[in-house]
Amino acid sequence: ADSFSLNDALAGSGNPNPQGYPGAWGNQPGAGGYPGAAYPGAYPGQAPPGAYPGQAPPGAYPGQAPPSAYPGPTAPGAYPGPTAPGAYPGQPAPGAFPGQPGAPGAYPQCSGGYPAAGPYGVPAGPLTVPYDLPLPGGVMPRMLITIMGTVKPNANRIVLDFRRGNDVAFHFNPRFNENNRRVIVCNTKQDNNWGKEERQSAFPFESGKPFKIQVLVEADHFKVAVNDAHLLQYNHRMKNLREISQLGISGDITLTSANHAMI
């Protein structure tokens, strides 16, 4: 297959959402997306975020459901209009047509979609990097954090720090050139001490290219997907999740949106 659609990816699976990530594997509608959109939920005139025109995105398996994907939302359907949790006030909620209630078949994935840049390409304006996203009440299982932006040319690093006061519960750090290798390093900092690094050689980021990072909080780990493909999971080293109250985003990126929601 030289083109990718979520319907194709799920064909024959016997499950319309086989543990699918919200907005990544199987939660988008097959039809009946935003009126006038070139692709369900896509920005007008663009390929869908995370998809590469003319080819399947990294980690996509045409004809089957990808592995290790995130659970779908508990209830289908779009938000009926109010801003989704973690989205920016003044923007329509994901799945809601501006000025109308949520349309049937529109994105059902809470704010796992693209709330900061409304569904019709309403410009959010780049967010200042470093950027701190408050996580009021901390994180908890089934919370989904979505970050969208573009990697700068000649990038060196991207950093996500899920912070608990002075500590860093989850440090997610793609490095574009560590001794001429690309690697993703994850770690935790407690009581001024950084722990043992966990390293991942799969590297879905490209200098100069847009990206979407989704972090799903589970009971015993963080699960990370990039550009709609599962990347890694990181076991919790800090158990008091409700105290992880801030996400710091920094590095060599321009940041378009950052939001969170329960799924």
Epitope: G165, N173, R175, N192, N193, W194, K196, S250
Partner: antibody, heavy 120, light 110 residues
């Protein structure tokens, strides 16, 4: 270019005070922990103090507790060390040092140091 | 007195390998705390050579490697070169959130 430049070192009498400054550039200063490390002439390295990016987490070596105070101003990309009740044994080159998650907390960026001499 | 114990000096010939040890306790090196190694040439600031026990920062030669077993960390330099002649310091976090350094090891290239 990532850079740290210390200033403020000088000759001071025992019992006196001194404030060292460190100007940071080339990285997101507020993201990283910062440290002061010193080295007496002909001796080894000695960690003095560290401060996290938000100034909420501050630690000191026992030998300076109550005499030295570390602080930072993220708006000015600056780190400080206020040294009071100085003693002859505090004579050393004082280094401003970054430690970050990028190096597992290792001290990956060092300034050139500023010399503090405590003598009557 | 330094908390971490290093040999005062080691020597080797060009092309040889040498190992510098760094002995601590269960409150620092042996307590699952990261060990780092620094190189310092005379009159210069130290340079990070190894972090998190065994990782090399970008730009550090792969002739430098680190390891840790129990309460002792080690730095190995293979294929010794003249420019490796310097002082080497180990460092560790500690259980009370402080940092400690070793006393330093002078590496002489014969």
């Amino acid at each position: 270019e990532v850079q740290l430049v210390e200033s403020g070192g000088s000759l001071v009498k025992p019992g006196g005070s001194l404030r060292l400054s460190c100007a940071a550039s080339g990285f997101t200063f507020s993201n990283d922990d910062m440290n002061w490390v010193r080295q007496a002439p002909g001796k080894g390295l000695e960690w003095i103090s560290s401060i996290d990016g938000s100034s909420r987490s501050i630690y000191y070596a026992d030998f300076v507790k109550g005499r030295f105070t570390i602080s930072r101003d993220n708006a000015k990309n600056s780190l400080y060390l206020q040294m009071n009740s100085l003693r002859a044994e505090d004579t050393a080159v004082y280094y401003c040092v970054r430690s970050s998650g990028y190096s597992g907390g290792g001290m990956d960026v060092w300034g050139r140091g500023t010399l503090v001499t405590v003598s009557s | 007195q330094s908390v971490l114990t290093q040999p005062a000096s080691v020597s080797g010939s060009p092309g040889q390998s040498i190992t510098i040890s760094c002995a601590g306790t269960s409150s620092d090196v042996g307590g699952s705390y990261n060990v780092a190694w620094y190189q310092q040439h005379p009159g210069k600031a130290p340079k990070l050579m190894i972090y998190s026990d065994s990782y090399r920062p970008s730009g550090v030669s792969n002739r430098f490697s680190g390891s840790k077993s129990g309460n002792t960390a080690s730095l190995t330099i293979s294929g010794l070169q003249a420019e490796d002649e310097a002082d080497y310091y180990c460092s560790s976090y500690t259980s009370n959130s402080a940092r400690v350094f070793g006393g330093g090891t002078k590496l002489e290239i014969k």
